[in-house]
Structures are given as C-alpha cells and as structure tokens.
C-alpha cells in the first residue's frame, strides 16, 4: 500500500505485521489474527481490530437521552469471527457453541443461544452516541469551541466525512457526540461510524491504534481535555431482540 | 538466490515427537512470513501455520493446533516446525515455504513416517 | 474457513489443446481495501514441491510461460493453459491466502492423451 511503502509499516493499524511480499514486492500489511490484507491509508475495520486484538497478547437541556432500544457493549472483548470484507459476521460462536446475533459494530443484539440460533443478516448501527464525561477544570468549555474541535478531531485524524458528526452536545462535564450513517449514506471509501467510533474509544482509554503516533493529545482553544468516563450507546436500524427476562431484570 | 533447505527424513514410532528444520538463505529472513505445509501421499496440500520471524508472532490452522509449534531462529535463519503425540495420519511430506503473494518459494520436503 | 473446490478432479488432452480448470472458493477472495484478489495458482510434479504459477489470481510469476493465465474475481476462478505442452503434466492447486487458516484446492490432474 502506498501508506506503508517508505518502511513497510501501517500508520493506521500497529496491529499489523508488514512484509515486502505485496504484488512486485511491495509492502502489504496483514492484520493480526486473521492474516488478512489492509488498506494502511484509512481506518481499519472494528472487526480485525478485535480479532488483531485477541491473538496478540447553553442553558438549555440539550443532552441525549438514549433510546429504549439503544445497546451498551456489556460483553465486553471476544475473538469475533470476521467476513472477507473484515466485517462481522452476523452470527457469532464462542468455543462452547453458544452463539448470538450482533450488528455491525459487533455488540450482541439477541439473547444467547446454541448453534441453531440463525442471524439472516448483519444489521447496521445507523447511531452512536458517545457519551464523555471530562475531568473539572476551572471553567466550562465553550461549547462551540468544544463543537469545532471534536469535529476536526474526527475529520482529520480518523478521516470521518464531516456528514457524519451529527451534533456535539455538551452540559459540563458531559461531553455527548453523535455519530449518524444510514446504509444509503455511506459510499465506497467512507469511514465506518463504528470504525471511527472505535478509534475514539482506545484514544480515549490512551491504547491509540495508531502506528508511533502520540497518544491522543485533546485540546480546546489550549486547554488539555481529559476524559474521566466513556460510556458508548449503539443504535441499529432494526431494534435488537431480547427476552422479556433480560428486559425487566 | 533464495533458497530454503530442510532437514532429512525422519521415521518416529506413533506417540513420538519430530524437528523438522527449513535453512532459509538468499533473503532477509526476518521480513517475510514463513509457513509450513502438510501433504499426506497421494493426497493435496494442507496449511499447518507460519511464523514471522522478525516478531515471532505465530499463527496456527485449528486442525493442527495443540500438536504443532513454529518456532524460528533468527540468529541461523532457521524455523522449525515440531509435530508431538504423532499418529499413523501425521505421515506426510511437511513444506515449508515463504509466503507472499509473489514469494513462489518452497523447501524440497521432508517426509516423516510413523510406523509401529 | 474458507472452502476451496476445483473442477474436473482430472482431465486428459492432447498436446496443443487449450485447457482450462476452475477454482471455486466459498467466500469471497477480495479484498475490498486493495481490490486484490488473493488466489494462487500452484503446479506440483510428483515428487517435486509445488512451484508458483499465478498470483492475484491473474499475475504470472517471473519465469512462467505466457500459455499459462489466471483469471476470474470474488468467488470465481480460472486457470487457462492455451496450448497444453507433455510437460504441463501435472496436478493444480489453487490456494486461498486471504484469511487465515489459508486453505488449498484438492487439486486437479492434468495428463496427455
């Protein structure tokens, strides 16, 4: 890839191994764990992340109050499986043959079942709401400010369309994005809300996926913001399905 | 020129462990994935797993998991493919090869037999 | 994993014919980030490893003869001799090293009339 080619590294996935062995013998770099080949000029894909991830070691109210259907990642890591394109597969297995359905972000979106559990297809995360909480500083951000910075923030280092950042909303502490992208929104070469967001959530946990890059350095008009909380909802096009018991426990 | 070179025949009594070396030269060994390949006689080609040895990470096919493990030397340019608890099954000419997608180069073979 | 199947297990012809054996693989082979297909071409002579004929599904290897050529996308793949020489007498693999574990063909036999 011409990201890698000058040492034959990625400088968007360092959970990668790159090797001279392309086509003519340029550099290609493959994901950890599933081995597949990845475009080091964009975000990779949550996917092989995870998967790379498990083989290695104003006055107004204006916050967003999460849907009834919205889904937090409560599951926490697995080794997910993965499909050519370095998506989910709708259907996920762990080593006991327990199985569940996720979306497109990877979250589990049905009750656990067995192998006979069917997932027809891979439903899309349409919303993300990343809900932050900064640590106290002398003075609330201005918002707008605030607004503009986390914008360029995903334009320029996670090479989000700025279409995509649907609002920042901000009622110190709480720092709340939305990210927004419908199936027919999103066009050959945009960037994954999901991908973006996942980016976002390492940065902010000081983990950055990025090849010999600093951490993630936040800053609003001089002013360091550290993030204390993240909590991130996930909102797909078809409401998941859970059991009554789930629902009410 | 490249060349990978591996290690005699070997006869092992089922139950047994076997080495089975491949000498890499012509090419920085340390760059490239190096992988290991099984065919039964008379049967197709099988992956076992590879290694990148300049960071020794090591991937391993479900099938031969638990029995198998890579390992390389970098100091000799040498990586190892070790087979235990061998079983009648496990005879088989074993490759080793760089990978790429232009890395057209294999080892001559080692057949290991395990007979009673 | 991905599940590689070849066509015809064997076939004879006579020196000069054109050939073509097929490969089809159960998921999809490219990869969407670099539009490259990542299917092998193999030639295996009995006792003799397998030598390299195509990658990318359609990229010769240096020092391959031109009647040999790979073709198809996706999940559907082709290797084409035009003109078969008593030398192309051998077994065909295809491989897929696109996600691991990579997986082989079981082969196709190619003999001379």
């Known amino acids: 890839h011409t990201a890698a080619q000058d040492n034959c590294t990625c400088p968007t996935n360092k959970m990668t191994v790159c090797s001279p062995d392309g086509p003519g013998g340029r550099c290609q770099c493959r994901a950890l764990g599933s081995g597949m080949a990845v475009d080091c000029s964009t975000l990779t894909s949550k996917c092989l992340l995870l998967k790379a991830r498990m083989s290695a070691p104003k006055n107004a109210r204006t916050l967003v109050r999460p849907s009834e259907h919205a889904l937090v990642d409560n599951d926490g890591l697995y080794d997910p499986d993965c499909d050519p394109e370095g998506r989910f597969k709708a259907r996920q297995c762990n080593q006991t043959s327990v199985c569940w359905c996720v979306n497109s972000v990877g979250v589990r979106r049905t009750d656990k079942g067995d192998l006979s559990l069917r997932c027809d297809e891979l439903v899309r995360t349409h919303h993300i709401l990343i809900d932050l909480r900064h640590r106290p500083t002398a003075g609330a951000f201005n918002h707008s400010d605030l607004d503009a910075e986390l914008r360029r923030l995903f334009r320029e280092r996670y090479r989000l369309h700025p279409k995509f950042v649907a609002a920042v909303h901000y009622e110190q502490p709480t720092i709340q994005i939305e990210l927004r992208q419908n199936t027919s929104q999103k066009a050959a070469g945009d960037v994954d809300i999901g991908d973006a967001a996942y980016y976002f959530e390492r940065d902010i946990k000081g983990e950055s996926l990025f090849q010999g890059r600093g951490g993630l350095d936040l800053r609003v008009r001089g002013e360091p913001l550290q993030v204390e909380r993240t909590l991130i909802y996930y909102l797909d096009e078809i409401p998941p399905k859970f059991s009554m018991k789930r629902l009410t426990a | 020129q490249v060349q990978l070179v591996q290690s005699g025949p070997e006869v092992k009594k089922p139950g047994a462990s076997v080495k089975v070396s491949c000498k890499a030269s012509g090419y920085t060994f340390t760059i490239y994935w190096l992988g290991w390949v099984k065919q039964a006689p008379g049967q197709g080609l099988e992956w076992i797993g590879n290694i990148f040895p300049g960071s020794a990470y090591i991937n391993y096919n479900e099938k031969f998991k638990g029995r198998v493990t890579i390992t390389a030397d970098t100091s000799t340019s040498t990586a190892y493919m070790e087979l235990s608890s061998l079983r009648s099954e496990d005879t088989a000419v074993y490759f080793c090869a760089r990978e790429g997608s232009n890395s057209g180069y294999w080892g001559q073979g080692t057949l290991v037999t395990v007979s009673s | 994993d991905i599940v590689m199947t070849q066509s015809p297990d064997s076939l004879a012809v006579s020196a000069g014919e054109r050939v073509t054996m097929n490969c089809k693989s159960s998921?999809?082979?490219?990869?969407?980030?670099?539009?490259?297909?990542?299917l092998a071409w193999y030639q295996q002579k009995p006792g003799q490893p397998p030598k390299l004929l195509i990658y990318?599904?359609?990229t010769r290897e240096s020092g391959v003869p031109d009647r040999f050529s790979g073709s198809g996308s996706g999940t559907d793949f082709t290797l084409t001799i035009s003109s078969v020489q008593a030398e192309d007498v051998a077994v065909y693999y295809c491989?897929?090293?696109?996600?691991?574990?990579?997986?082989f063909g079981q082969g196709t036999k190619l003999e001379i009339k």
């Open positions: 998921q999809s082979l490219l990869n969407s980030g670099n539009q490259q297909n990542y």
């Open positions: 990318g599904a359609s």
């Open positions: 491989q897929s090293d696109h996600i691991y574990p990579y997986t």
